[in-house]
């Protein structure tokens, strides 16, 4: 299994939208993609699941496109706010 | 709304060559992967494969890989089947479907059918 | 690859009939799509993740089951609900979808 973030930095604007990209390798059948944003204390919050085979998941301002034939999950953040500033990460499970 | 307008019906010579197409429309194309899947009176609906119009990463079923090469032109919002080495048994109708995330396909193309005949 | 096996594979009925066909999977899967197709036609979703309804189908239809075996229920058939009727499942890698139920007015 491998889970691999090309975007090492990305800058955006308040009130706007920024989607980061998460692309992964996995030999199981079913799995969930999680997103998790990294505060500056360390500690990992979650903020969205993704299923293997469910619809595109959402959950208020963040929201995933999933792309399960290319293994491609990417998170989508609206309406950007100053504390959304921080480190994101993406991870495979089962 | 959304719409995935095929190419026409298609007569052709075995051991020729065939691109079918399938533009879409009423989305961003990019923001979705494209699906084909072949239908015939014997084996019923089999997936294809699919590509991912934003990367050009695809992904084939098995049974197909060498038969069928997908692409995607991001400017037209157009995406592409080839379909090499053509028998008889080829012969079927050809759909483009798009997905909703990892369940199920929401919308169809119309279908073309292709006939493999000398 | 995961197979789907449907059955029966024609259904006859007479209006008003409470019919049901059955998709049964070769491993077990979280979730079965149906689709219903009419002659010259493309596939049209019509039950999505096992039970959920897809837009403007009526309500006469509904759909149930777990694991491996998976159903289509239409309360009361009427003459526009002629069709075949397909499974699909996009639990493995590759996504499969049965033969088909063929369904027929009597």
């Known amino acids: 299994q491998k889970v691999t973030q090309a975007q090492s930095s990305v800058s955006m604007p308040v009130r706007k939208a920024v989607t980061l990209n998460c692309l992964y390798e996995t030999s199981w059948w079913s799995y969930y993609i999680f997103w998790y944003k990294q505060l500056p204390s360390k500690e990992m919050i979650f903020l969205i699941r993704q299923g293997s085979d469910e619809q595109n998941a959402k959950s208020g301002r963040y929201s995933v496109n999933f792309k399960k034939a290319a293994k491609s999950v990417a998170l989508t953040i609206s309406a950007l706010q100053l504390e959304d500033s921080a480190k994101y990460f993406c991870a495979l499970g089962e | 709304q959304v719409q995935l307008q095929q190419s026409g019906a298609d007569l052709v010579r075995p051991g020729a060559s065939v691109t079918l197409s399938c533009k879409a429309s009423?989305?961003?194309?990019?923001?979705?992967?494209m699906h084909w899947v072949k239908q015939t009176p014997v084996h019923g609906l089999e997936w294809i494969g699919a590509?991912?119009?934003?990367?050009?990463?695809?992904a084939y079923n098995q049974n197909f890989k060498g038969k069928a090469t997908l692409t995607a032109d991001k400017s037209s919002s157009t995406a592409y089947m080839e379909l090499s080495s053509l028998t008889s048994e080829d012969s079927a109708v050809y759909y483009c479907?798009?997905?909703?995330?990892?369940?199920?396909?929401?919308?169809w193309g119309q279908g073309t059918p292709l006939t493999v005949s000398s | 690859q995961i197979v789907l096996s449907q059955s029966p594979a024609i259904l006859s009925a007479s209006p008003g009939e409470k019919v049901t066909m059955t998709c049964r999977a070769s491993?077990?899967?979280?979730?079965i799509h149906w689709y219903q197709q009419k002659p010259g036609s493309s596939p049209k979703p019509w039950i999505y993740?096992?039970?959920n309804l897809a837009s403007g189908v009526p309500a006469r239809f509904s759909g149930s089951g777990s694991g491996t075996s998976y159903s289509l229920t239409i309360s009361r058939v009427e003459a526009e609900d002629a069709a075949t009727y397909h499974c699909?499942?996009?639990?493995?890698?590759?996504?499969?979808f049965g033969a088909g139920t063929k369904l027929e007015l009597k």
């Open positions: 479907t798009r997905p909703r995330g990892g369940s199920h396909f929401d919308h």
């Open positions: 009423g989305y961003t194309f990019t923001d979705y992967e």
């Open positions: 590509i991912d119009p934003e990367t050009g990463i695809t």
């Open positions: 491993s077990s899967v979280r979730y």
């Open positions: 993740a096992t039970s």
């Open positions: 699909q499942q996009w639990y493995s890698d590759t996504p499969t």
